[in-house]
């Protein structure tokens, strides 16, 4: 017995007194315990446990799967074993078909022997096929066959336990190797918008996708700077062996105004986390916001080209959208198109294209749209520039000479005299009287100035320049002048175009 | 070879001690359970004591007649077994066997030829 | 302790006789019973294990039965080199008690 301090309890002995025991099937299987506190004994083999609570345990007629440990345990919690194997010629290996291994972790093939005399105890592919070059095992006949670092190559693997048993090899059941993937990266997570605007009562759904290796992957919904437990619901889906995808929906339905916030979709495994945010932004109604994309005041010269371009934010979507010249709704010349193709896009763009502008085409440009809640507008101010035009150029019957220009922005006229045959007119002659004529008018028409000398002044023969001109350009007339004697000719006036 | 071999025997005075010893080649000995078997001279078997391998914590049995005065050990790494035999009286005298038990019963599938202690005055 | 009682002592036979000896416990031992054979100056050599096994080796001749208290190891046809002292040993509690032998002898 085993050598113990007086008075210190010892562990029960086992009679027959040795660690293993071989029976042959059909004969008895008697095993004796033998302790002033006995209190049971217990079989275990593979899943299953028996207990008995005699000192003797007997089996009348041993089977392979009384095949096991005996353990018999005294009322000091202390025990002893024997591990019995009954040798059943037809029956060599016990199998508990089940097999799941870890990536990079050992599993045990569960095929303990009935005999642990045999030989060549090891694992065979199924099919004759040979196993993985790099799968390495250890065999033990009490508890089955270890391969040692399941690689995830293994998954699906078929073998068998093999022995040889009086030279002839024998195989158990075939075992199907189910390898759990180890977590060797963080999990993949993506959300499906990055940003929600919704109004007030409006459903909010938003959906992570989760991508792992297995189902074991941790996910969930937070709320930032909040602990409250969202409600999700989750679909999932193996894409073959090592490719988990899990779908978590999380669903608001009547949403709040204090919703509004960053939620994030959390993902861990034993490897490390990742995460990924959406903001949802909740209003009360919705809104239109237009931005001009250029000064609201424009000016153009004649026969040019401008575009008028706004950007817009609308939510909900803009349903109307119109330009508005002379209460005159454009039906073409522009264009209305989203910022971008995102999906949660509220920024739009609208165009409108106006070509070979005419002195008359100034005026309000107005850009309106509309959606469901609310309508907003804004105006352009287009100023045409002209080039002078001179209207008239008269000898009026008190002897004055008078000229009208009109032009965009408003001309000035100037009055020159020529002497006698000399084309270039430098001697300036001072206006009598300049008046603007239609001052009061229409804003965005031509502006009329009316100016007049007196041709008295005049003692020789030559010509009169009157010239108009403005930052756009410059237009002139000519008055001829003659003496007979002393009386003057009639004054043959003519214009001279300058560009 | 696969054999046993005890030496130690001989001729001792009643209270006197003496050590067998038993020396094991061609099998693997810290697999197995040793005993020592004794065989009085024209007599039968009687079985003296075993220890257990190192499975077994190497455990220690004895006859009642040699219990507190015999002592049985082993040295794995020597492949060998001992029998101390302290305090020894004239009906100790037989033939001594030392035993090898199988791994997975008990009886004595390997014995040796055996060392006679004669303990007379 | 466990009690080994083996009959006969002795028995006289000749070759090609069909021997039984028997052996009996005094409690019930299962199976776990061996028998030796030894010839004068030898040491004992295991026939039969468990009752009924035959060690490897044993000519098929020998063979054993029972169980629980009541055991027998025949001879089917003796042998000269047969001729010994058999030993039957019970190997479930200690101390593991020998029986006290029969010898076989020619007639």
């Known amino acids: 017995q085993p050598s113990v301090s007086p008075g210190e309890p010892s562990p029960p002995s086992i009679h027959p007194a040795k660690s293993e025991l071989i029976v042959r099937v059909g004969n008895e299987i008697r095993l004796l315990c033998i302790d002033p506190g006995f209190v049971k004994w217990t079989f275990e083999i593979l899943d299953e446990t028996n207990e008995n609570k005699q000192n003797e345990w007997i089996t009348e007629k041993a089977e392979a799967t009384n095949t096991g440990k005996y353990t018999c345990t005294n009322k000091h919690g202390l025990s002893s074993s024997i591990y019995v194997f009954v040798r059943d010629p037809a029956k060599l290996f016990l199998v508990d078909r089940s097999l799941y291994g870890k990536e990079d972790n050992d599993t045990l093939v569960r095929c303990p022997l009935t005999d642990p005399e045999v030989t060549s105890y090891s694992l065979k592919g199924c099919q004759g096929k040979p196993l993985p070059k790099d799968l390495r095992f250890v065999p033990d006949p009490k508890a089955g066959i270890t391969i040692k670092s399941v690689k995830r190559a293994y998954h699906r693997l078929c073998l068998h336990c093999s022995a040889d048993q009086e030279g002839k090899s024998v195989l158990s059941d075939k075992f199907i190797l189910k390898v759990r993937p180890a977590f060797k990266a963080v999990p993949v997570v993506s959300v499906s918008k990055a940003s929600y605007l919704l109004r007030e009562g409006e459903e909010f759904t938003v959906t992570c996708t989760i991508k792992d290796v297995s189902s074991s992957v941790y996910s969930t919904w937070k709320r930032e700077n909040s602990q409250t437990k969202l409600q999700e619901k989750y679909n999932s889906w193996h894409h073959g062996d090592f490719n988990y995808e899990r779908q978590a929906t999380l669903t608001i339905s009547s949403a709040r105004v204090n919703d509004s916030g960053v939620f994030m979709c959390y993902a861990n495994n034993t490897f490390g986390s990742a995460n990924v945010t959406t903001t949802l932004e909740v209003v009360d109604k919705g809104f239109i916001n237009i931005f001009p994309m250029i000064n609201t005041t424009v000016f153009v010269n004649d026969g040019e080209n401008v575009d008028l371009i706004v950007e817009y934010e609308a939510f909900p979507k803009p349903e109307h959208q119109q330009w508005i010249y002379m209460n005159r709704t454009f039906t073409d010349k522009w264009e209305d198109y989203p910022k971008s193709e995102n999906e949660s896009n509220i920024r739009y763009v609208s165009e409108l294209h106006l070509t070979r502008l005419k002195g008359t085409e100034g005026g309000t440009y107005t850009f309106l749209v509309s959606n469901s809640d609310v309508n907003a507008s804004i105006a352009f101010n287009v100023y045409v520039n002209t080039k002078p035009e001179i209207l008239t150029y008269d000898r009026l019957v008190n002897g004055m000479l008078q000229c009208v220009a009109a032009g965009f922005p408003e001309p000035t006229i100037d009055w020159y005299f020529c002497p006698g045959t000399e084309q270039r007119c430098s001697a300036s002659v001072l206006p009598v009287d300049v008046q603007t004529l239609n001052a009061s008018g229409p804003p965005f028409g031509k502006l009329v100035v009316q100016s007049s000398i007196d041709s008295s002044a005049f003692k020789h023969n030559g010509t009169v320049e009157c010239k108009a001109y403005n930052d756009v350009g410059k237009t002139s007339a000519y008055f001829n002048f003659a003496f007979k004697g002393n009386n003057k000719e009639q004054i043959h006036p003519h214009t001279l175009f300058t560009p | 070879e696969v054999q046993l071999v005890e030496s130690g025997g001989g001729l001792v005075q009643p209270g006197g001690s003496l050590r067998l010893s038993c020396a094991a080649s061609g099998f693997t000995f810290v697999d197995h359970d040793m005993d020592w078997v004794r065989q009085a001279p024209g007599k039968g078997l009687e079985w003296v004591g075993r220890?257990?391998?190192?499975?077994?914590?190497?455990?220690?049995e004895y006859a009642a007649s040699v219990k507190g005065r015999f002592t049985i050990s082993r040295d794995d790494s020597k492949n060998s077994l001992y029998l101390q035999m302290n305090s020894l009286k004239t009906e100790d005298t037989a033939v001594y066997y030392c035993?090898?038990?199988?791994?997975?019963?008990?009886?004595?599938?390997?014995w040796g030829r055996g060392t006679l202690v004669t303990v007379s005055s | 302790d466990i009690q080994m009682t083996q009959s006969p002592s002795s028995l006289s036979a000749s070759v090609g006789d069909r021997v039984t000896i028997t052996c009996r416990a005094s409690q019930s031992i299962s199976s776990y019973l061996n028998w030796y054979q030894q010839k004068p100056g030898k040491a004992p050599k295991l026939l039969i294990y468990a009752a009924s096994s035959l060690q490897s080796g044993v000519p098929s001749r020998f063979s054993g039965s029972g169980s629980g208290t009541d055991f027998t190891l025949t001879i089917s046809s003796l042998q000269p080199e047969d001729f010994a002292t058999y030993y039957c040993?019970?190997?479930?509690?200690?101390?593991?008690?020998f029986g006290g032998g029969t010898k076989v002898e020619i007639k």
């Open positions: 035993a090898r038990e199988p791994k997975y019963w008990i009886d004595f599938d390997l």
């Open positions: 220890t257990r391998n190192k499975l077994g914590s190497y455990t220690t």
């Open positions: 040993q019970q190997s479930y509690i200690a101390p593991y008690t």
